[in-house]
């Protein structure tokens, strides 16, 4: 709880925000968790704390570890944890998966690729953009503020895009790079009001207390790649990410499949170590697109162990 993964490359700037929500202007103390050593606030240090931000200028592989931040108030301190990993620079062009930020999708009508984490940095335009390590050139590519716009997107534009910018701290410049995948969606086809294939409406799923359980929300939205379509789970009307129960997680990313030419998505809800109180929750499978939203509700019931007779 209150933990966040952050990563960067050695000799680049890395800035991490305290995962625990506070408000601007509150005192935030940072510690290196393994030693409980306080992180200094003086900017002359290579690693220093600046309010809600922890700055590695530049980062070193040895900086990897868990950092604790405490948002201070006289009546209620709030603690968060930043799990920081600094990697060695790769000699080849390949960007490993562990350095990739979330994938974004684009289409002919919408082809913005945002540079991840850039809002944490003090940077000035223009951004430099690379695709598969090659600098992007030509009038089709426009670096605008913190994102890249590609005109007349084609299937060949799919790939890994890296943004590179300079962070300035008290007159000193530090390089930062961030990479994410871009996929191109086919505009042809049509979309329908979502059809949920599973679970059935008001389905009762039997689970065993103490065991793990999976619920799959699966829906189809039309033919071809869909501009806006999503399936997700809610608990008692609240998003899984906001519900705050670490045992209950949605599978990261949505699996896309084409069933009889239809575009379908599924999202798996994983419940670890099922507890009695999980049986009291309402599990909603939501499927939504531009046409609207459809909801199927599932409840859990206890599965009685089967008697084994000879």
């Amino acid at each position: 709880k209150f933990s966040k993964q952050s990563w960067g490359l050695e000799n680049e700037a890395l800035i991490v925000r305290c995962p625990r929500q506070g408000k601007p202007s509150y005192t935030v103390d940072w510690y290196y968790s393994q030693t409980n050593k306080s992180i200094p606030t003086q900017e002359r240090n290579r690693v220093f704390a600046s309010g809600q931000l922890l700055k590695f200028l530049p980062a070193a592989v040895a900086d990897s570890g868990i950092y604790t931040c405490i948002v201070r108030s006289p009546t209620f301190n709030r603690t968060g944890y930043a799990n920081v990993t600094i990697y060695k620079k790769q000699s080849d062009c390949n960007v490993p998966d562990y350095l990739m930020y979330s994938t974004v999708s684009g289409s002919e009508k919408n082809s913005k690729i945002y540079c991840p984490t850039i809002d944490l940095y003090n940077w000035t335009a223009p951004l430099e953009w690379f695709k598969n390590c090659q600098a992007l050139q030509g009038s089709r590519y426009r670096a605008h503020k913190s994102f890249l716009v590609i005109d007349n997107v084609m299937t060949e534009d799919a790939g890994d895009y890296t943004c590179k910018f300079i962070h300035n701290e008290n007159g000193a410049n530090y390089s930062v790079t961030a990479t994410r995948s871009f996929t191109v969606k086919d505009e042809q086809g049509f979309s329908l009001f979502p059809v949920i294939g599973a679970p059935a409406q008001n389905e009762i799923k039997e689970v065993e207390i103490g065991k793990n359980a999976n619920l799959t929300c699966s829906a189809c939205f039309g033919k071809g790649t869909q501009f806006l379509a999503a399936v997700l789970w809610q608990l008692n009307g609240t998003k899984i990410t906001d519900f705050g129960e670490p045992r209950i997680q949605q599978e990261e990313g949505q699996n896309q499949s084409f069933s009889n030419g239809l575009a379908c998505l599924d999202m798996v809800l994983r419940i670890a170590d099922v507890k009695e109180e999980d049986l009291l929750l309402q599990y909603d499978c939501l499927a939504l697109n531009l046409h609207g939203l459809r909801r199927h509700t599932v409840r859990l019931s206890r599965k009685n162990p089967i008697d084994h007779h000879s």
Epitope: F2, R20, Q21, G22, K23, S25, Y26, T27, V71, R72, S73, P74, T75, F76, R78, T238, D242, F243, G244, E245
Partner: antibody
């Protein structure tokens, strides 16, 4: 966006227990924050009653502590107020509110509770 | 308990003018470089709305016409320039220790 909604009886008899519930949407009460009850007698100022934080820990105003219980139902994403042995002085608009840190950031619309026989 | 005393109890201001409300605490609400004083606006029939936190920080979405200042025991909320829809009750609140307490309120009327 966090949204809060108070509910409960609008009329309570003297010496009985006042019970109110605050339903939270848009955020899980176990994720973070402190979840407060505040009251405001008609035409008067605000009085902080107490809170329950995301972990279930409670803190009460000492002036009401002997009569107050704040609890929660995580399965319904609700927290509740019970105030025992009420008198006419407990007539007020009761608000629930959330605290990110220190200040009351989001408020419910409030519900008027009248103590009368 | 820390007692917060607001003054004046009410004031009438013309649009475009400055309104100043003060809040005095019975003991200091400042520590470790911060002042744990917050200001709220309450219009009739509505819940209070946070305007200023930590004495001088404007809450997100609140117009820059509102500002706060002060430290220790003496704090000020300023509205400049006042607009017609600023007619409301204004409350200060501290969070220096438990219990949190509020001022008795200041009613701002627009002439």
């Amino acid at each position: 966006q966090v949204q809060l909604q108070e509910s409960g009886p609008g009329l309570v008899k003297p010496s009985q227990t006042l019970s109110l519930t605050c339903t939270v949407s848009g955020y899980s009460i176990t994720s973070d924050y402190a979840w407060n009850w505040i009251r405001q007698p008609p035409g008067k100022g605000l009085e902080w009653i107490g809170y329950i934080d995301y972990s279930g820990s409670t803190t009460y105003n000492p002036s009401l502590k002997s009569r107050v219980t704040i609890s929660r139902d995580t399965s319904k994403n609700q927290f509740s107020l019970k105030l025992s042995s009420v008198t006419a002085a407990d007539t007020a608009v009761y608000y629930c509110a959330s605290t990110v840190i220190d200040s009351m950031d989001y408020w419910g619309q409030g519900t008027l509770v009248t103590v009368s026989s | 308990d820390i007692v917060l005393t607001q003054s004046p109890a009410s004031l009438a201001v013309s649009p475009g003018q400055r309104a100043t409300i003060t809040c005095r605490a019975s003991k200091s609400v400042s520590t470790s470089g911060h002042s744990y004083m917050h200001w709220y606006q309450q219009k009739p029939g509505q819940p209070p709305k946070l305007l200023i936190y930590l004495a001088s920080n404007l809450e997100s979405g609140v117009p820059a016409r509102f500002s706060g200042s002060g430290s220790g025991t003496d704090f000020t909320l300023t509205i400049n320039p006042v607009e017609a829809n600023d007619a409301a009750n204004y409350y200060c609140q501290h969070s220096r220790e438990f219990p949190f307490t509020f001022g008795q309120g200041t009613k701002v009327e627009i002439k």
